[in-house]
């Protein structure tokens, strides 16, 4: 036990326990303390101290056993690499400072793998990748000796196994024992060597969790399954059979602290709606504990694989629930998980076996009652038949990611009960909770779901096209007449979709320039395609000056776009990538989801505007109900519409309409803004539904919006659901699945 | 010169055991697994298993499971291969190989071969 | 298990032309991480013990001839004689080693046409 539960509060005096360079905090109502130094700074010799039923603070001890009289502030070090094989690295040093460089050679023959050069990062790591030096010859390659560990083996042949170990004070994480297995693949995890003042940043954190989560949740055909010696990109296999299990495990002891409990909320909201956003439908389970635990969703429980209700009964949980009893019990905590895993009368279900299972349990790393819960992993592993086999080891069914947050982890007991795959991270320690908010919201952002439509990083450090990233920004050069703006979106990685009136028939490639991403180079435009029955003058014979009908045009680049965090595409209907987003089976049909993105009534859209350089969402209502024909009706204020007597002449079932003061005052288009999307944003993700083409009023004479706006001021958009088979045609070779 | 160097020729009866012989010279001998391959008359090769020479440690093809037996003898640089309840299909030129170093995987050094004959 | 299967059974060239062995797995030999595919060659003459000719798929064992090469990776691959002499009258065979047991192809018998 760290310490006692029953001793009174705030029994320790605070007199001597500063930190010189640094300051001090209190934790757990007095109890404990954590040092709090700058920026590239380390508390010297401990990070934490609690406060002993002597009455006294734990004596500051340093790593060899010396006890300290006063704490301080220290510079941190990165530490240096013990050995390296087959080659030479320079500078040699004892120890470097933060922002030092080290660089890595290999002898003749031999090739080097990972970072060449790394830095000495302000956390304490070295930036890169573990470099090495291989010749090649083995049966598997060279594990390699991560910085700060050292190694025993030097034979790579199949079944030769390594292991790792680290200096005094320091904490292994990772695998200590590797072997090489069939395939050329090692078992368990790159290690390193943690001082307790180190910690995941945000970004690292995102990146790992995200790459090996996509690895269990990225469905690929049934066929795929390769053996034990398996290295292609570790895939579950979602096949119609199969299915997932997600165990969310929240501490709820005294240790965590009320605000930390409801951060630790927010975190697997968002993890629910990312693991959603792939278009998987696993079975939730929900524990949260403290002395005992308490289960909230049952996997068995027929709501628990809808994300929606699962989401509610996660925002309903009260940290106070566990006041009374606010012990840490994690071995208790995993049996619940166990109960939930296990079968009635121990006799297997059809297909048990075809279960994947992804526990994420979010702790302080402190239990302190009920026993080591490792021994509670090994029977989930035993449950589950996984590692019994050696041809079918079936470690893919059991993931185990554990998050440590706070300075009073204990990485040996976090670092126990996580999974170890190879190239994979499943035990993690942040700082703290807004760090840990920190990841769940950059795991929106991670090169495996960049393919994902209508996804955006909707963080507080986002720019305007990570909150936009579909944007495109178009203007075509006319020489001697000026240039002409225009928006476009991102629909694949060769296509921008924008209105067709942007161009004229003489307007050439050279002279379209195209940006996406905020970059500001140009792309390379290959062809301008317009939709056939567009006409701008084809009812001039009328007294119809401009007629905008089907006013769409694609736009193919010469070049791929490189997806990434400000360049993404925007869903497009009647599209697989869309049935995904929208959550919808994959039976869903196209009229399916016209009925769920543009029911018959006023339907909440938005539109992206350029305003002083900065892109805005303006949001708008489609009129598809009751207002619609009194919104269509306006379309005779505009200019050059005045003598039209029937005004579908002019607003064809093309177009959709909105604008006007009801059922609320609707910002408008300005003439910059035609050939962007007209968006529907539902369940955090963003389906264009039209094409902005023009507009009654143009309210911003002047390059300003005016404010003041008439009711009739009204814009039309083109509708995509009624231009399909032409983005089908046109779009065929791109990957979106259309239906 | 790196040299492996097999036991005679074998004829055996259906049902009875056989132990062929490779003794290594011209390397450290635990250095290096030992694998041992079979060819049947005119046909294909076969994989049975390896020893490594350091540990005693042992793999078989499943195929071979509960009927063959590798052991070695560092005294005297040996690797053995008993195969019991022998068959008429068991009749095959075995070999022992070396593989390198690093890798045991690819057969860079041969014994001369052992035929073993399984006739009643 | 994976199963290795070569083509021709035989196959007879001219001295000096090109002679082409391939050789299919029922599954991928290349780790992906490693780019390496678990593939040799081998060659046997009458009455010999088996003899290296190529690992890692396209790496010649020292000491053999440069008119041998092996290519291909993942499921397909290629062993090329690119100027027959009278000594390459042989079997071959292919090798996988990603997963065990490690299996053989059937062989391919080289002969002078």
């Known amino acids: 036990t760290p310490w006692s539960l029953a001793r009174p509060q705030g029994s320790c005096s605070l007199e001597g326990v500063e930190i010189k360079g640094g300051s001090f905090r209190l934790l757990q109502e007095g109890q404990a303390l954590e040092y709090v130094c700058p920026s590239g700074f380390y508390p010297y010799p401990v990070q934490t101290r609690t406060c002993r039923s002597t009455g006294s603070w734990s004596t500051l001890k340093t790593q060899d056993q010396k006890t300290v009289r006063k704490a301080e502030c220290r510079a941190i070090h990165c530490p240096r690499p013990h050995d390296f094989e087959n080659g030479e690295y320079w500078p040699r040093s004892p120890y470097y400072n933060v922002s030092d460089e080290i660089s890595f050679h290999c002898y003749d023959g031999y090739t080097l793998r990972g970072s060449a050069n790394r830095t000495c990062q302000v956390n304490g790591r070295w930036s890169g990748q573990t470099a090495i030096c291989d010749n090649g010859a083995g049966y598997c390659s060279n594990p390699g000796i991560p910085i700060g560990t050292r190694k025993v083996g030097s034979q790579y042949r199949l079944e030769d196994s390594v292991t790792y170990h680290c200096s005094r004070g320091l904490t292994l994480r990772g695998s200590q024992r590797r072997t090489c297995q069939e395939g050329g693949s090692w078992s368990g995890t790159e290690p390193s060597c943690q001082d307790s003042f180190m910690y995941d940043t945000p970004q690292e954190v995102a990146e790992a969790f995200l790459s090996s989560l996509t690895e269990t949740i990225e469905g690929v055909d049934a066929e795929d399954g390769h053996g034990p010696g398996e290295q292609q990109k570790r895939k579950i296999v979602l096949d119609p059979s199969g299915s997932m299990n997600i165990y969310l495990v929240l501490d709820g002891s005294d240790s965590i602290g009320a605000s930390n409990f409801t951060g630790a909320k927010k975190c697997l909201v968002n993890l629910i709606e990312k693991v959603a956003s792939y278009g998987v439908k696993p079975r939730y389970g929900l524990v949260t504990y403290a002395t005992y635990p308490k289960i909230w969703v049952k996997v068995s429980e027929a709501d628990s694989s809808n994300a929606d209700w699962v989401t509610k009964q996660l925002n309903e949980i009260n940290y106070e629930d566990h006041k009374l009893k606010s012990g840490t019990n994690t071995k208790k905590a995993l049996q619940a998980v166990y109960s939930m895993m296990s079968w009635p009368d121990d006799v297997p279900p059809e297909g048990w076996n075809r279960t994947r299972h992804v526990i994420i349990l979010m702790t302080d790393g402190l239990h302190n009652m009920g026993g080591d819960p490792i021994t509670v992993i090994d029977e989930i592993r035993d449950l589950l038949y996984i590692g019994k086999d050696r041809k079918n080891p079936r470690e893919d069914y059991l993931d185990v990611y554990v998050f440590g947050v706070g300075p009073l982890v204990n990485q040996v007991n976090i670092n126990a009960l996580a999974s170890k795959k190879d190239n994979e991270q499943h035990v993690f320690k942040v700082k703290d909770m807004e760090n840990l908010e920190d990841v769940f919201y950059q795991m929106i952002d991670e090169s495996q779901s960049l393919s994902l439509c209508g996804m955006v990083w909707e963080h507080r450090k986002g720019t305007d096209y990570h909150k936009q990233p579909w944007q495109a920004k178009i203007s075509v050069i006319r020489p001697s007449k000026g240039h002409e703006s225009c928006m476009g979106a991102v629909v694949s990685e060769y296509f921008v979709l924008t209105a067709a009136h942007c161009f004229t028939v003489d307007d050439k490639e050279h002279s379209i320039k195209v940006s996406v991403g905020g970059e500001k180079r140009d792309l390379e435009i290959e062809v301008v395609l317009f939709h056939p029955n567009y006409n701008i003058n084809g009812k001039k014979e009328a007294g119809i000056p401009e007629f905008y009908d089907y006013d769409v045009a694609l736009i193919k680049l010469k070049n791929k776009l490189k997806y990434g965090q400000t360049i993404r595409p925007i869903c497009l209907p009647c599209t697989e990538g869309t049935t995904r987003a929208l959550r919808l089976p994959p039976t869903t049909t196209c009229q399916q989801q016209k009925e769920e993105l543009l029911p018959a009534q006023d339907i909440k859209a938005l539109f992206v505007s350029e305003e002083e350089k900065k892109l805005t969402r303006k949001e708008v209502y489609i009129k598809n109900g009751d207002k619609k024909g009194s919104c269509e009706r306006d379309a005779q204020y505009a200019p050059g519409y005045d003598k039209v007597k029937d005004i579908s002449e002019v607003v064809t079932p093309r177009f959709l309409c909105t604008g006007g003061v009801s059922p609320y005052a609707d910002p408008n288009t300005c003439r910059g803004d035609s050939g962007g999307p007209l968006i529907v944003h539902k369940r955090s993700r963003f389906i264009q539904v039209g094409v902005i083409s023009w507009g009654v009023v143009d309210v911003c004479k002047n390059q300003k919006r005016q404010k003041q706006v008439p009711a009739h001021a009204r814009d039309f958009h083109i509708n995509l659901f009624q231009v399909l088979p032409w983005l089908k045609e046109k779009l065929q070779d791109e990957d979106l699945g259309f239906l | 010169e790196v040299q492996l160097v097999q036991s005679g020729a074998e004829v055996k009866k259906p049902g009875a055991s056989v132990k062929v012989s490779c003794k290594a010279s011209?390397?450290?001998?635990?250095?290096?697994?030992m694998t041992w391959v079979r060819q049947a008359p005119g046909q294909g090769l076969e994989w049975m298993g390896w020893?490594?020479?350091?540990?005693?440690?042992?793999k078989y093809a499943q195929k071979f499971q509960g009927r063959v037996t590798m052991t070695r003898d560092t005294s005297i640089s040996t690797a053995y291969m008993e195969l019991s309840r022998l068959r008429s299909d068991d009749t095959a030129v075995y070999y022992c190989?070396?593989?390198?170093?690093?890798?045991?995987?690819?057969?860079?050094?041969w014994g001369q071969g052992t035929l073993v004959t399984v006739s009643s | 298990d994976i199963v290795m299967t070569q083509s021709p059974d035989s196959l007879a060239v001219s001295l000096g032309e090109r002679a082409t062995i391939n050789c299919k797995s029922s599954?991928?030999?290349?780790?992906?991480?490693?780019?390496?595919?678990?593939l040799a060659w081998y060659q046997q003459k009458p009455g010999q013990p088996p003899k290296l000719l190529i690992y890692w798929a396209s790496t010649r064992e020292s000491g053999v001839p440069d008119r041998f090469s092996g290519s291909g990776s993942g499921t397909d691959f290629t062993l090329t004689i690119s100027s027959l002499q009278a000594e390459d009258v042989a079997v071959y065979y292919c090798k996988q080693v990603y997963n065990l047991p490690w299996t053989f192809g059937q062989g391919t018998k080289l002969e002078i046409k």
């Open positions: 599954q991928s030999v290349l780790n992906s991480r490693n780019k390496k595919n678990y």
């Open positions: 020893i490594n020479p350091n540990s005693g440690g042992t």
């Open positions: 190989a070396r593989g390198y170093y690093a890798n045991s995987a690819w057969f860079a050094y």
């Open positions: 011209g390397y450290s001998f635990t250095d290096y697994y």
